[in-house]
Amino acid sequence: TEVKVTQPEKSVSVAAGDSTILNCTVTSLLPVGPIRWYRGVGQSRLLIYSFTGEHFPRIRNVSDTTKRNNMDFSIRISNVTPEDAGTYYCVKFQRGSSEPDTEIQSGGGTEVYVLAK
């Protein structure tokens, strides 16, 4: 059955300088491949976080993603700035065979509104 990616919140509001959590769960970890967060869509979308071991300043995973059955890929963004405003997508990839990973499913997106403090 096809993997489903769920982002329960259509939008969240956060005051500048505060933290916010963007929720994402998947229904299956198969086929194997990473899960990544992006802001925006299309060619100009920006990689925000990847669950592949790299360090991303101000962003961390919420659950213990080292659990082999973990299906929660929510992230916490700290010290939010106005530049963080936009729509965030949680995306499941299938690992490529000697080629780039293939996007197979995206969540519906969560729009982040940044309020002046």
Epitope: P31, V32, F51, T52, G53, T66, K67, N69, S97, S98
Partner: antibody, heavy 118, light 108 residues
Framework: EVQLVESGGGVVQPGGSLRLSCAAS????????MSWVRQAPGKGLEWVAG????????YYPASVKGRFTISRDNSKNTLYLQMNSLRAEDTAVYYC???????????WGQGTLVTVSS | SYELTQPPSVSVSPGQTARITCSGG??????YAWYQQKPGQAPVTLIY???KRPSNIPERFSGSSSGTTVTLTISGVQAEDEADYYC???????????FGGGTKLTVL
């Protein structure tokens, strides 16, 4: 520099118990899943246990399930393997290994020898 | 018995290219890695996530995958590459880490 140093190996009689330790340094231990892998004399590698970063979830192959218990103390940067009801076929060098994000292994300790013999 | 299958031995002359294959895992549920082990030493990770090479591993070691078969390629083989090479995997469907039986690389 990532370092993994195993200890606790030795000679034990069949049916006996032993606890192995692995002291980790050079990385944020509490952020990484860890595993134990063994190698019987002249044989290949065999994975025997894995544990999540927080320590709540553990994983075993059928060959050791119910006899071996993996655990960790993140405050001491130490990984453990409790081995009970040991058999002659458990004789091996036991390595601790750090897991990558997708549960492969990137760093290995030097190993500690466990000999089960009467 | 080992869940992953690799040839017991491979021989190659210095400067030539050695290829070691590994099969047996489902492409949709497996990740693969390659480990080198010299006599009396601990394993060293050469390749992980099918084709990623740690920064301390020479570029002559590379990994590739095609369907259910993965391949370790050693270009310009050197005498010091003589060792046992193990294919290892992570099976997301069973949460286990199977290994192949190992391949002894002999440099002629």
């Amino acid at each position: 520099e990532v370092q993994l140093v195993e200890s606790g190996g030795g000679v034990v009689q069949p049916g006996g118990s032993l606890r192995l330790s692995c002291a980790a340094s050079g990385f944020t231990f509490s952020s990484n899943a860890m595993s134990w892998v063994r190698q019987a004399p002249g044989k290949g590698l065999e994975w025997v246990a894995g544990i999540s970063a927080g320590g709540s979830d553990t994983y075993y192959p059928a060959s050791v399930k119910g006899r071996f218990t993996i655990s960790r103390d993140n405050s001491k940067n130490t990984l453990y393997l409790q081995m009970n009801s040991l058999r002659a076929e458990d004789t091996a060098v036991y390595y601790c290994a750090r897991e990558t994000w997708n549960h492969l292994f990137d760093y290995w300790g030097q190993g500690t020898l466990v000999t089960v013999s009467s | 018995s080992y869940e992953l299958t690799q040839p017991p031995s491979v021989s190659v002359s210095p400067g030539q290219t050695a290829r070691i294959t590994c099969s047996g895992g489902s492409y949709s549920s497996y990740y693969y890695a390659w480990y080198q082990q010299k006599p009396g030493q601990a394993p060293v990770t050469l390749i992980y996530s099918d084709d990623k090479r740690p920064s301390n591993i020479p570029e002559r070691f590379s990994g590739s995958s095609s369907g259910t078969t993965v391949t370790l390629t050693i270009s310009g083989v050197q005498a010091e590459d003589e060792a046992d090479y193990y294919c290892g995997g992570y099976d997301q469907s069973s949460y286990t880490n199977p290994f192949g039986g190992g391949t002894k690389l002999t440099v002629l």
